[in-house]
């Protein structure tokens, strides 16, 4: 923490300008009025302050706005944003996409994923929902940032916005996020023809239930292995060998290459070896011929 000292008369600050780079930390603390700093935040980013000096400026803003900075200040934070913690950002109320763009640009190339995730969360809260303009901003300035949002926040995406989401925007989404997005995508693309529908729904299929995957297997989609590997394990396990063969089409030979990776490995263990042999890929590990499979979970449920 910076020591409190009085400001020498010759060092008094009447405006935020380049002369401040020659101020020591304690001089900045004593001589810069927090209200003046807030009013002239748009000048700060043009001045080559050291990280230590930025610490002092942040400290002054924190004192002035203990409940969180107003958006007029946030918009002009510039490199001062790099000093913010997720806890700081959580206090903010941000509604402007210009503010979001400005801060996303500043954070680029820095290890700020937690801060950026919190900022995006605040924007969604501030705007009331994840609307098309917000999604467009995220896809343009922060590919992959959509997946930093919680499933709860993503549930505010209207299906009409889903078309603006590109495959690379979903690259970092986890199963719980795709569980939320998939039904919206299904609704958004429901009027498309078979092949066009598959191209559009493909990035969201990590949230698809078994019955939808089975339905796709009847549509000659020739799913690639990358997409198959992203399906939920629970959605893959009930598929028969014939269904998987239909689903993958010419890509079925890729099962051999991925046979030790989940969900392929888990699926193989659930199939009869006889059925696996029909693929002619040399897949091993299926249930040997003549074995009876007892599903004990069903018996337990009945007792």
């Amino acid at each position: 923490d910076v020591e409190r000292t009085t400001c020498p008369p010759e060092k008094e600050v009447h405006e935020i300008d380049e002369s401040l780079i020659f101020y020591k930390k304690r001089e900045l603390e004593a001589c810069v009025d927090a209200a003046l700093l807030a009013a002239q935040m748009d000048r700060v980013d043009a001045i080559p302050f050291t990280y230590e000096q930025l610490d002092v400026l942040k400290h002054k803003l924190d004192e002035l706005y203990p409940q969180g900075y107003p958006e007029s200040v946030i918009r002009h934070l510039g490199h001062l944003f790099l000093k913010m913690s997720p806890e700081d950002i959580r206090k903010w109320n941000v509604t402007s996409l210009e503010t979001l763009k400005a801060l996303l640009k500043v954070s680029k190339g820095h290890e700020m994923s937690a801060q950026v995730a919190t900022l995006i969360d605040r924007v969604v809260v501030g705007r009331g929902q994840l609307d098309k303009d917000t999604v467009d901003t995220l896809t343009a300035f922060c590919p992959g940032c959509l997946c930093s949002l919680s499933p709860e926040r993503l549930s505010s995406v209207p299906p009409s916005v889903i078309g603006a989401v590109r495959p690379q925007d979903l690259d970092t989404c986890g199963p719980r996020q795709l569980d939320v997005l998939y039904p919206k995508a299904r609704l958004a693309f429901q009027n498309m023809s078979g092949s066009e529908y598959f191209v559009k729904i493909r990035p969201f299929l990590g949230g698809a239930p078994t019955e939808d995957v089975k339905a796709l297997s009847q549509q000659n989609v020739s799913m690639d292995l990358a997409t198959f590997m992203k399906l939920r394990r629970e959605a893959v396990l009930p598929l028969t060998v014939a269904e998987v063969q239909k689903l993958l089409g010419p890509h079925v030979e890729g099962l051999k290459v991925e046979e030790q990776h989940s969900p392929v490995r888990d699926w193989i263990l659930k199939q009869r070896q006889d059925d696996l042999d029909t693929l002619g890929l040399g897949l091993q590990g299926g249930i040997p011929n003549g074995y009876l499979i007892l599903d004990l979970s069903v018996r337990e449920a009945l007792s």
Partner: antibody, heavy 119, light 108 residues
Framework: EVQLVQSGAEVKKPGASVKVSCKAS????????MDWVRQAPGQGLEWMGD????????IYNQKFNGRVTMTEDKSTSTVYMELSSLRSEDTAVYYC????????????WGQGTTVTVSS | EIVLTQSPATLSLSPGERATLSCSAS???????LSWYQQKPGSSPRLLIY???NLASGIPARFSGSGSGTDYTLTISSLEPEDFAVYYC?????????FGGGTKVEIK
């Protein structure tokens, strides 16, 4: 442009660990597995294992089991290969190589990271 | 594991000549699961041929591949100065993936 950029050369003592990074760009990170292949001085290529960036699932060459760990960070499109209990025979160039899921060939390679193990 | 043996270890030829490189597997390899790489000193390997006979993107047509079962061949119809390098075959028919020991094609 598709690129795999690896971390710089490392010099380690026997018994230590090394962690090599490989940052991918220019393609959908989760559509490709990342494999690691090493090459000892004047020798051929040796496959170490792979990681599926989508699931984080790994497969290791049994020769390295217990010593190699592969991890990924989807947020930065980076994969890591850590090799522990280093010995002089681990002195090699370590390559990351991209492999389209469902195929077994490596269509893009990193520039290689030289790891020297010496007391 | 499947052992891939490449022969000859070194091939001394002149530009314009035909090069034939062999790769023999210790047990049968599914032909879809064999590829060839080229490596020049100080550089990373480069994919030449995948699935036994498919030319990788940007690879000139003088390179070709063939074979099945345990015997595979890489042919360079007419050697160019930039073709002098080490060539590796690679199988992913069974774990662990393995590479051949390499064939060095040098200028005679």
């Amino acid at each position: 442009e598709v690129q795999l950029v690896q971390s710089g050369a490392e010099v380690k003592k026997p018994g230590a660990s090394v962690k090599v990074s490989c940052k991918a760009s220019g393609y959908t990170f989760t559509d490709y597995n990342m494999d690691w292949v090493r090459q000892a001085p004047g020798q051929g290529l040796e496959w170490m294992g792979d990681i599926n960036p989508s699931t984080g699932g790994t497969i290791y060459n049994q020769k390295f089991n217990g010593r190699v760990t592969m991890t990924e960070d989807k947020s930065t499109s980076t994969v890591y290969m850590e090799l522990s209990s280093l010995r002089s025979e681990d002195t090699a160039v370590y390559y990351c190589a991209r492999r389209r899921i469902g195929t077994g060939y490596f269509d893009v390679w990193g520039q290689g990271t030289t790891v020297t193990v010496s007391s | 594991e499947i052992v891939l043996t490449q022969s000859p270890a070194t091939l001394s030829l002149s530009p314009g000549e035909r090069a034939t490189l062999s790769c023999s597997a210790s047990s049968s390899v599914i032909s879809s699961y064999l590829s060839w790489y080229q490596q020049k000193p100080g550089s990373s390997p480069r994919l030449l041929i995948y699935r036994t006979s498919n030319l990788a993107s940007g690879i000139p047509a003088r390179f070709s591949g063939s074979g099945s079962g345990t015997d595979y061949t890489l042919t360079i119809s007419s050697l160019e100065p930039e073709d002098f390098a080490v060539y590796y075959c690679h199988q992913w028919s069974s774990f662990p993936y393995t590479f051949g020991g390499g064939t060095k094609v040098e200028i005679k």
